[in-house]
Every structure is written in structure tokens, then in C-alpha cells.
């Protein structure tokens, strides 16, 4: 995501399943923290926003030409997962330790 | 990049080296096809976006709450190389048959 | 003036072993990716795989047929390129020329046969 | 077989111009990427073209040029000097590295 002024970070998102309908099928927890990734990716990109050359270049080609193309964007580059109790098909509570992806570990310019 | 009404793609986007300096010190190409990608990441995410369960539930909370949390982002999922030939410190021409992260092979949304 | 002398060619039994070197100078070695390419007799060219300069890793790859079984390293220190061949194949046998791309050496004849 | 696709041989007399074909038939290689060594017999290759970029030493009457999934070498005011190998190579990007095609064995006549 964009930010206006501050530069590519991660922030808390606090995600109550009953908001987005998931409570229909995860029964725990009934919220948790997503974490987004907030800010702009601004020139020079830093080296903690790991940018890829792609990335650097497109920071370049956006500071000659700012109206033609546009800036890095400031996304989760990895990821954590969550542990979740959930109903299955039939119905039967189940615990998944690890449900993938759920969760943002760091955020960077790409 | 974000985009205005199209859904996440991969657009052109021709790099001249010149444009951002880097001619300095590559030799060749003079310019390559870089690509961009562009558009918006909108609710339902296609398949052909490879949305991560951070970006699905992103959306969700987007679409709940649009002015607290933004949307995914569309970005390269996948980079190519491409072949330079650069200068050394010395001057020398010298190959770098795989350079890598150069061009955007696939976008999606994150 | 650019120059790279391949040495360590000679005959070898199969299964066997060689260590093939490229002394290198003219250019700033340390951060020149380096390729090894082969030519087997009356035959084209052939990557044989590459190694990145350390400051970008010193990452190594190898073209399919000489996976698991030749390894390239360098000496930075020495300006020295090297290929250690083991496991040695009949189908080995060819000129081997180490590279940057732009510059190649005069090339060494390995030759594997019983 | 070589997933770049070259005629096993060539030829002219003096003064004539010919040209090389190299076409592509693997979707890992882009032709972008595709460049030529020379081979003269008795000697190592060397590189004679890379995208608009001819080494110095390299006579102008070589040039290169690529089309949809092919690459073309020409050579104009063709001499007895340049009768050898002229090999095509490109980026595999599978392999993470060059890919070569069979060569072509120029011969000059007469």
C-alpha cells in the first residue's frame, strides 16, 4: 500500500474474522494481528526495504518520468503464518498450527 | 503501482539506461523491456493475480473499511534476468550473461 | 591488454579427476563473473557454468551435464579461476575455455579415455 | 538438439553479403538476449556482437539485427578472413546461463 509521507514500514492491523466473514468457518482466534505494509518507496530506496533491481530502477524511471510511471510499491516480501482453530467439512473443530501467509514478517519496495 | 480502473497487469515499460544513469558504466543494451506492473487489486482477486491470504484478507478489510486500510498492491511476483555488458573499474567490457531481476515476468497482488 | 591462460589439460582415465586453472589479468578480476564453455572436437560451444564475483555472492551454476560432478571456484587474491572435474566421463573430452564473456583464454585439451 | 537453431553452413564470395539466422525455439530464451561469436579456425571465440555494441577490432561490415523469434548476423563486403564458425548464443534462463546454438561454418569462395 501507499502512504503519503512516511517511508515503507510495517504497521499493525488488528483483523476481527467476524468483519471480513470468516467467522463462519475459523472458530479461534476470533481476531488477530495482520500487520499491513504502509508508506511510500521513496528515492534512494534503502536497503531495508530490500529492493530488487527491477524495483531501483522503476524508483529511477518514476523520478525522470513521475507522471508516465509509477513508484515501487510497499508490500509484504515475507510472510508468517497463524495457528487457527477451525470447523472442517463435517463440521469437526480442527487445529491447523500453521496456516500460511497470514500474517506480515517484513515489508518491502517492489 | 496502483491503477485507476484496469485490474493488476503486466504493462510495457521501455528503460532507457541514459534516463537514469546507468549508461555510465553498461555498455549494452541501450534500452530494455522492463515492464510495469499496473492496476488495481480488486475484490474478488482473480486467480491470475496469485493473491496471498495476507492480500485476500487485506481486501476484505479494505472493502469493510476502505478509508482505514488500503488495497493490495499490485507488484512483480516474478522477475527475469537479462544479458548486460559493462565496464569494469578499469574500463574492460565484460558479459554478464544473467543479470538478474531486471524485467517483471509475472505481476500479482500483494 | 586483457589476457586469460587456461593450464591443467592432459589425459585422464575415466572416473578419474583434474583441476583445470585461468590466470587472469588486465581487467578487475575480483569483480568479473567468470564462465567456463567447452568445445568437443569438430563440435559447437558449450557452457559448462559460471561463477558470480564474491561481492554479489560468489553464487555458482552449472549446465546440466556437469552437475554434482565439476565444481568452479576462484582466487581472488591469485586472479585465478578454477574447475575441478571429477567423475570423469568419456563425453568430457573437449577444449576448455574459461571466459567473461567478452574476453576467452586459448583454451586446455582434456582428454578422457582408458 | 540446440534450442537455438542455426544453418550448419554458409556461403559467398568476396564482396558478396550474407547473412547468419538464429532462430529461437525454446519460450526460456528471450531473443533480446541473443548475441554472436565469431570462431575463426585454430583460435578461441569472440565475442563480434552484442545487442548495438561491436567490441573494437570488430570490423564494421558485421552487424546484427532480430526480428519476432529471430536473430540475423550480416556481413557485408564479405573477405577470405572471415571464413569460420559464427555461433549465436542467448540466456537460458532456466539453465542461469548461455545457451549456444550448433554454429554455422562460414565459407568464403573462389
Known amino acids: 500500500s501507499t502512504g503519503a509521507g512516511s517511508h515503507c514500514q510495517k504497521t499493525s492491523l488488528r483483523v476481527n474474522f467476524e468483519d471480513i466473514g470468516w467467522n463462519s468457518w475459523i472458530i479461534a482466534p476470533k481476531e488477530y494481528e495482520a500487520y499491513e505494509c504502509k508508506g511510500g518507496c521513496f528515492f534512494p530506496l534503502a536497503d531495508d526495504v530490500t529492493p530488487t533491481k527491477h524495483a531501483i530502477v522503476q524508483t529511477l524511471v518514476h523520478l525522470k518520468f513521475p507522471t508516465k510511471v509509477g513508484k515501487a510499491c510497499c508490500v509484504p516480501t515475507k510472510l508468517s503464518p497463524i495457528s487457527i482453530l477451525y470447523k472442517d467439512d463435517m463440521g469437526v473443530p480442527t487445529l491447523k498450527y500453521h496456516y500460511e501467509g497470514m500474517s506480515v514478517a517484513e515489508c518491502g519496495c517492489r | 503501482s496502483t491503477g485507476a480502473g484496469s485490474h493488476c497487469q503486466k504493462t510495457s515499460l521501455r528503460v532507457n539506461f541514459e534516463d537514469i544513469g546507468w549508461n555510465s558504466w553498461i555498455i549494452a543494451p541501450k534500452e530494455y523491456e522492463a515492464y510495469e506492473c499496473k492496476g488495481g487489486c480488486f475484490f474478488p482477486l482473480a486467480d491470475d493475480v496469485t493473491p496471498t491470504k495476507h492480500a485476500i484478507v487485506q481486501t476484505l478489510v479494505h472493502l469493510k473499511f476502505p478509508t482505514k486500510v488500503g488495497k493490495a498492491c499490485c507488484v512483480p511476483t516474478k522477475l527475469s534476468p537479462i544479458s548486460i555488458l559493462y565496464k569494469d573499474d578499469m574500463g574492460v567490457p565484460t558479459l554478464k550473461y544473467h543479470y538478474e531481476g531486471m524485467s517483471v515476468a509475472e505481476c500479482g497482488c500483494r | 591488454e586483457v589476457q586469460l591462460v587456461e593450464s591443467g589439460g592432459g589425459l585422464v582415465k575415466p572416473g578419474g579427476s583434474l583441476r583445470l586453472s585461468c590466470a587472469a589479468s588486465g581487467f578487475t578480476f575480483s569483480n568479473a563473473w567468470m564462465s567456463w564453455v567447452r568445445q568437443a572436437p569438430g563440435k559447437g560451444l558449450e557452457w559448462v557454468g559460471r561463477i558470480k564475483s564474491k561481492t554479489e555472492g560468489g553464487d555458482t551454476d552449472y549446465a546440466a551435464p556437469v552437475k554434482g560432478r565439476f565444481t568452479i571456484s576462484r582466487d581472488d587474491s591469485k586472479n585465478t579461476l578454477y574447475l575441478q572435474m571429477n567423475s570423469l566421463k568419456t563425453e568430457d573430452t573437449a577444449v576448455y575455455y574459461c571466459?567473461?564473456?567478452?574476453?576467452w583464454g586459448q583454451g586446455t585439451l582434456v582428454t578422457v579415455s582408458s | 538438439q540446440s534450442v537455438l537453431t542455426q544453418p550448419p553452413s554458409a556461403s559467398g564470395t568476396p564482396g558478396q553479403r550474407v547473412t547468419i539466422s538464429c532462430s529461437v525455439t525454446n519460450t526460456d530464451i528471450d531473443i533480446f538476449n541473443v548475441h554472436w561469436y565469431q570462431q575463426l579456425p585454430g583460435t578461441a571465440p569472440k565475442l563480434l556482437f552484442f545487442h548495438d555494441y561491436r567490441p573494437s577490432g570488430v570490423s564494421d561490415r558485421f552487424s546484427g539485427s532480430k526480428s519476432g523469434t529471430s536473430a540475423s548476423l550480416a556481413i557485408v563486403g564479405l573477405q577470405s578472413e572471415d571464413e569460420g564458425y559464427y555461433y549465436c548464443?542467448?540466456?537460458?534462463?532456466?539453465?542461469?546461463?548461455?545457451?549456444f546454438g550448433g554454429g554455422t561454418k562460414l565459407t568464403v569462395l573462389g
Open positions: 571466459t567473461t564473456g567478452t574476453y
Open positions: 548464443a542467448g540466456l537460458d534462463e532456466a539453465m542461469r546461463g548461455p545457451v
